[in-house]
């Protein structure tokens, strides 16, 4: 059904925001790329570019698509379907423990410590200790300190990505 | 973590206006879907409004169309709900609400899927 092709099933210059297309939801559900009415009869699209719904559902609104911050590069770009990815530019990280923000990855290792692994969007540069081969957490001293944590704390792995 | 705060409840005579604000704080407040709820003395939460992040989609409960308009400046980050013709059975604490959306469901109360409320602000109707 003609209704149901969303706009970005469309080349850009065909995406007009202007009016939104409908159709019938099914079971009380509109599909990816559309919300319900308030009387529960049509589906209508979002809108390319500002808003999004990823599933089957019978939300009232479409969800406002994400706008990547300062700090962050777009991977790729809202669609209907699909919410915006945004990745820390090079250089910088997102955390687990604070993913709203791209913090600044460590130029280089404490001392007795050495480089095993690089930075990447999702994580710091990893050290481990030279002698036992121990991930080093924790608050980092600058390259020059010594190191005077435990090393036999974890490393907590960073996993989330933008 | 976004915070909500209503103001612009207080006594009104039957037949006249209110016009109630919500002052939302916090990170990216203009991204949610906002709503109006009520809850009249010894009754439950009932819905009232809602409004899209954009504020160009609007639903409202039955026992308000035409009379209430839910509408939002995300310049000032600022809900709104202008009501006229207001009637005794109006009289009750209005809250705020915000989410990224609402399903069909708010329409019966699911108040589920609600991620922020307001503390409420008080309107009575009354002559």
């Known amino acids: 059904e003609s209704a149901l092709i969303t706009q970005q099933d469309l080349a850009p210059q065909q995406r007009a925001a202007p009016q939104q297309k409908r159709s019938s939801p099914s079971e009380g559900l509109c599909p990816p790329g559309h919300h319900i009415s308030e009387d529960g009869r049509d589906c209508i699209s979002c809108k390319y570019g500002q808003d999004y719904s990823t599933h089957w559902n019978d939300l009232l609104f479409c969800l406002r698509c994400t706008r990547c911050d300062s700090g962050e590069v777009e991977l790729s770009p809202c669609t209907t379907t699909r919410n915006t990815v945004c990745q820390c530019e090079e250089g910088t990280f997102r955390e687990e423990d604070s993913p709203e923000m791209c913090r600044k990855c460590r130029t280089g290792c404490p001392r007795g410590m050495v480089k095993v692994g690089d930075c990447t969007p999702w994580s710091d540069i990893e050290c481990v200790h030279k002698e036992s081969g121990t991930k080093h957490s924790g608050e980092v001293p600058a390259v020059e300190e010594t190191v005077t944590s435990s090393p036999g704390t974890p490393a907590s792995p960073c996993s989330l990505s933008g | 973590e976004v915070q909500l705060l209503e103001s612009g409840g207080g006594l009104v005579q039957p037949g006249g206006s209110l016009r109630l604000s919500c002052a939302a704080s916090g990170r990216a407040a203009s991204d949610y879907a906002m709503s109006w709820f009520r809850q009249a003395p010894g009754k439950g939460l009932e819905f009232v409004s809602a409004?899209?992040?954009?504020?160009?989609?609007?639903v409202y409960a039955d026992s308000v169309k035409g009379r209430f308009t839910i509408s939002r400046d995300n310049s000032k980050n600022t809900l709104y709900l202008q009501m006229n013709s207001l009637r005794a059975e109006d009289t009750a604490v209005y809250y705020c609400?915000?989410?990224?959306?609402?399903?069909?469901?708010?329409?019966?109360?699911?108040?589920?899927?609600?991620?922020?409320w307001g503390q409420g602000t008080l309107v009575t109707v009354s002559s």
């Open positions: 409004i899209n992040w954009g504020g160009e989609d609007t």
């Open positions: 609400a915000a989410a990224p959306s609402f399903s069909r469901s708010v329409l019966d109360g699911n108040l589920s899927q609600i991620d922020y």
